[in-house]
């Protein structure tokens, strides 16, 4: 299915416009910002949503910028150039001409320059650390059903195979999740790591994404398991290009 | 030829215990889940659990309240079942049912399951 | 705890003819529902997943509908060979679930 046919809405993205105007009647829905037909089957790609989010009112909930923690993007939220497939252009640029090369998950992985950079490939992110840390608890977490629950809300919530979450680091307070999606990994149809990192961190900020479904509660054998801050690192097949200089800043 | 095959079933004592195999052939173990579903003459089919062999992540019915736990020995591409103080209730055939690799949870590939009867 | 309620639990077809099953989700589980087929001594056999989606080798006779907490199970054409137990399974999670399977539904074939 394309949308939920009865009321014709996007289970997996809110940020959407939907209309039985499909083949045969059928519900279609069309991210905001960007006007594409999305998959409601599975996740919007992380660029579309950035769009979309740029796009809503400026009093809208969902802009509430990252915490200075979330490292998502240290350059805070642009509104990106998305290629048809609805992914990242390697090269994106502001609208005072400032340019600069982003990999995957649309993170700046070169100095900023004007026009004239050349980005030659959308660098992919194939190693995703997220840090979190949860708030106090009578006890620390058992860590085979903490990583067990981590798991099944990967695949369940966020549709994303077990094998490419890698690992679930757990020392109280912290918990880290390693996930892991090479190139030659991701099949068709598989739910890219960055995508569903992204979905990850607004669920966990108290910003979900999915239509109707209710917010992340997440529960460890029933203790709610509440988290208080949120670090995401990203790895690219091929290291990022800064300066010395901001290498040493 | 992918397969699986249940093993170990047979009479047991009210309040007994028994633990069942499932030997996997023909496919990588670790690229699966696999459940336990059991079924009780003549009554419909009753999941009891769940377990994901790579990670050895297990996930369990609510009614089995720890009285039944799941495991594998994934260089032998085998799953378990132990099952304890068992009742009559128990009595029924257990099948393997493996996942279609896929993150949803349907079971493509079952073996022909194993008669346990729980009776004195 | 998602609850699988299957109706009707027996009914009868005639050769060459078409029944419905029914099976209702107790609360949303958007297209993640699978049906089975199974006959007397043999393990259950996936027939549809995704709501709507024939498994390998499963004859085009059988057909599957509905998103949400609504679902059906339309088999046409009905032949001797179909006479089985149907069941519905929710594919959506395995957490905190106490039986993702329903009741079951007899088909008899006369």
């Known amino acids: 299915h394309t949308a939920a046919q009865d009321n014709c809405t996007c289970p997996t993205n809110k940020m959407t416009v939907c209309s039985p105007d499909g083949p045969g009647g059928r519900c279609q829905c069309r991210a905001l910002g960007s006007g594409m037909a999305v998959d409601c089957s599975t996740l919007t790609s992380k660029c579309l949503l950035l769009k979309a989010r740029m796009s809503a009112p400026k009093n809208a909930r969902t802009l509430v910028r990252p915490s200075e923690h979330a490292l998502v993007d240290n350059d805070g939220l642009y509104d990106p150039d998305c290629d048809p497939e609805g992914r990242f252009k390697a090269r994106q640029c502001n609208q005072t001409s400032v340019c600069w090369c982003v990999n995957s998950v649309g993170v700046r992985r070169t100095d900023k320059g004007d026009l004239s950079l050349r980005c030659d490939e959308l660098v992919r992110t194939h190693h995703i650390l997220i840090d979190l840390r949860h708030r106090p608890t009578a006890g620390a977490f058992n860590h085979s059903d903490l990583d067990a629950e981590l798991r099944r809300l990967f695949r369940e919530r966020y549709r994303l195979h077990p094998k490419f979450v890698a690992a679930v680091h757990y020392e109280q307070p912290t918990i880290q999740i390693e996930l892991r999606q090479n190139t030659s990994q991701k099949a068709a149809g598989d739910v890219d790591i960055g995508d569903a990192a992204y979905y990850f961190e607004r669920d966990i900020k108290g910003e979900s994404l999915f239509q109707g479904r209710g917010g992340l509660d997440l529960r460890v054998r029933g203790e709610p398991l509440q988290v208080e801050r949120t670090l995401i690192y990203y790895l690219d097949e091929i290291p990022p290009k800064f300066s010395m200089k901001r290498l040493t800043a | 030829q992918e397969q699986l095959k249940e093993s170990g079933g047979g009479l047991v004592q009210p309040g007994g215990s028994l633990t069942l195999s499932c030997k996997a052939s023909g496919f990588d173990f670790n690229n699966y889940g696999v459940s336990w579903v059991r079924q009780a003459p003549g009554k419909g089919l009753e999941w009891i659990g769940y377990i994901y062999p790579a990670y050895h992540n297990t996930y369990y019915a609510t009614w089995v309240n720890g009285r039944f736990t799941i495991s594998s020995h994934n260089a032998q591409n085998t799953l378990y079942l132990q099952l304890n103080t068992l009742t009559a209730a128990d009595t029924a055939t257990y099948f393997c049912?493996?996942?279609?690799?896929?993150?949803?949870?349907?079971?493509?590939?079952w073996g022909p399951g194993t008669l346990v009867t729980v009776s004195s | 705890d998602v609850v699988m309620t299957q109706t009707p639990a027996s009914v009868e077809v005639a050769v060459g003819g078409t029944v419905t099953i029914k099976c209702q989700a107790s609360?949303?589980?958007?297209?993640?529902l699978a049906w089975y087929q199974q006959k007397p001594g043999q393990p259950p056999k996936l027939l549809i997943y995704e709501a709507s989606k024939l498994a390998s080798g499963v004859s085009s006779r059988f057909s599957g509908g509905g998103y949400g907490t609504e679902f059906t199970l339309t088999i046409s054409g009905v032949e001797c060979a179909d006479a089985a137990t149907y069941y519905c399974?929710?594919?959506?999670?395995?957490?905190?679930?106490?039986?993702?399977f329903g009741g079951g539904s007899e088909v008899v074939v006369k």
């Open positions: 049912a493996r996942d279609t690799g896929s993150t949803d949870y349907n079971f493509n590939l």
């Open positions: 609360e949303d589980i958007e297209s993640y």
């Open positions: 399974q929710q594919a959506l999670t395995v957490g905190n679930v106490d039986n993702p």
